[in-house]
Amino acid sequence: MGRARDAILDALENLSGDELKKFKMKLLTVQLREGYGRIPRGALLQMDAIDLTDKLVSYYLESYGLELTMTVLRDMGLQELAEQLQTTKEESGAVAAAASVPAQSTARTGHFVDQHRQALIARVTEVDGVLDALHGSVLTEGQYQAVRAETTSQDKMRKLFSFVPSWNLTCKDSLLQALKEIHPYLVMDLEQS
C-alpha cells in the first residue's frame, strides 16, 4: 500500500514551514491508540517532510499513519488536505484494514532497525564488527568499503543507514542479529523502551 505513504508525503510537503512545525507539535500531544509509541520529541522536531513521512510509516504503518496524519491536519483546521487523505484511504482500502486491527496487535510497529534509527546512529560504537557480520550477505564490497571510509562511528552508521531503504526484511533482521551479538545491552535497552 505505497499509495498511503505517498499521500502522507504529498500532504506534508504542502505545508508551509510554520504549518509543518505546528503539525509536529500537535503530533507530540495527539491522542494515540493504545499500545502505540510516540515519536521522540528531539528527533521529531528536526525532521523534514520526507523524514517525518518515513517515521510516521515506520512507527504506525501506513494505515494508521494515514489516519493519524488526517487527525492532526483536521485539528489544525486544514480540512481540504485531510479530505484528500481520506480519499486515498478509501481507495486503498486502508479504512477496512485499520478498523479491523486491534490496537495491541500492531503496537510498537515498524522494524526495530527503522524504529531506533537515531539511537543506533548515536549509540553504536563497534561499527566495524557490525559491518563484518553484514559483509557479503547484506552489504556489497563497495558498500562495505564506503561505510568503513567514514571517520566517526556516527558517520559510519549514517552511511550504513543510507543503504537500509533498499533492504528487505531479511537484511534488516541480519543487522538486528549483528547488533544483538555486538551490542546486546543497547538492543535490550532500546527494546525495553
Epitope: 504503518l61 484494514a97 486491527v101 510497529t109 526495530f112 528487505n168 526484511l169
Partner: antibody
Framework: QVQLQQSDAELVKPGGSVKISCKVS????????IHWMKQRPEQGLEWIGN????????MYNEKFKGKATLTADKSSSTAYMHLNSLTSEDSAVYFC???????????????WGQGTTLTVSS | DIQMNQSPSSLSASLGDTITITCHAS??????LNWYQQKPGNIPKLLIY???NLHTGVPSRFSGSGSGIGFTLTISSLQPEDIATYYC?????????FGGGTKLEIK
C-alpha cells in the same frame, strides 16, 4: 481479532508433496511475518522458517532447506508451506504463527494457527 | 544453532504447590527467552516473553527469571488448568530453537 486459519489434515503417500495454507484475518497481511513450526508426536517444536509478505523475503532453518518452500499470496492474505519428497519423518503437526510485534528483537509468537496434521503413509 | 535444554522432562506435583522448570541455553542469549504452555491437543500459548515479562491475560502465578544461559519458569499455587507441556524458546538468533518440553502432571 487476529486469526490464523490453517488447512485441514492431509494424508499423503511417501515421495509425494503437500501444500499447507494459513489464511490470516484481523490485521494487514503485509505488516507481519508468518513463521512455520513442526511438532512431531511427543516431541518438541522445531522452527522451519518465515516469510514476510510485505516484500516476499524468506528465511529458512538450514535443516528444512530443500524440504520446505514458503510463499504468500497477498490477494487472499494466505501464507503457504510446500513440503516435498515426503517420508514418514515428515509426519507431524505443522503450525503457522505470527510474532506479537513486527520487527521486535524478541521473536515471540502471540498468535498461532490451529495446526495441520500431516500423515505420510502408504 | 543454539541448543535449549529443558529440565525436568516431566514433573508431577500437587494442587497448590509451587513448581520450577529450568531452561539452559548452549550459549549466551541475554534475555531473549520466551515460555509457552501447550495443553493436550491444543496450540502453544505464549506465557512469558523476554525472560520475565508476563504476556497479556496470563495469570500472575506464572513468573519467569534468568538471563545469559540459565532461565526458570515458576508456577506458584498450582491449579488444575495448569496441566500442560511447557516449552522455552530462544529469540537470540536464527534458527529459532525450542526446548524439548516439560510435561506437568497433577499428583
Amino acid at each position: 481479532q487476529v486469526q490464523l486459519q490453517q488447512s485441514d489434515a492431509e494424508l499423503v503417500k511417501p515421495g509425494g508433496s503437500v501444500k499447507i495454507s494459513c489464511k490470516v484475518s484481523g490485521y494487514t497481511f503485509t505488516d507481519h511475518t508468518i513463521h512455520w513450526m513442526k511438532q512431531r508426536p511427543e516431541q518438541g517444536l522445531e522452527w522451519i522458517g518465515n516469510i514476510y509478505p510485505g516484500d516476499g523475503s524468506t528465511m529458512y532453518n538450514e535443516k528444512f532447506k530443500g524440504k520446505a518452500t514458503l510463499t504468500a499470496d497477498k490477494s487472499s492474505s494466505t501464507a503457504y508451506m510446500h513440503l516435498n519428497s515426503l517420508t514418514s519423518e515428515d509426519s507431524a503437526v505443522y503450525f503457522c504463527a505470527r510474532p506479537y510485534y513486527f520487527g521486535s528483537a524478541s521473536y515471540y509468537f502471540g498468535y498461532w494457527g490451529q495446526g495441520t496434521t500431516l500423515t505420510v503413509s502408504s | 544453532d543454539i541448543q535449549m535444554n529443558q529440565s525436568p522432562s516431566s514433573l508431577s506435583a500437587s494442587l497448590g504447590d509451587t513448581i520450577t522448570i529450568t531452561c539452559h541455553a548452549s550459549q549466551n542469549i541475554n534475555v531473549w527467552l520466551n515460555w509457552y504452555q501447550q495443553k493436550p491437543g491444543n496450540i502453544p500459548k505464549l506465557l512469558i516473553y523476554k525472560a520475565s515479562n508476563l504476556h497479556t491475560g496470563v495469570p500472575s502465578r506464572f513468573s519467569g527469571s534468568g538471563s545469559g544461559i540459565g532461565f526458570t519458569l515458576t508456577i506458584s499455587s498450582l491449579q488444575p488448568e495448569d496441566i500442560a507441556t511447557y516449552y522455552c524458546q530462544q529469540g537470540q538468533s536464527y534458527p529459532l530453537t525450542f526446548g524439548g518440553g516439560t510435561k506437568l502432571e497433577i499428583k
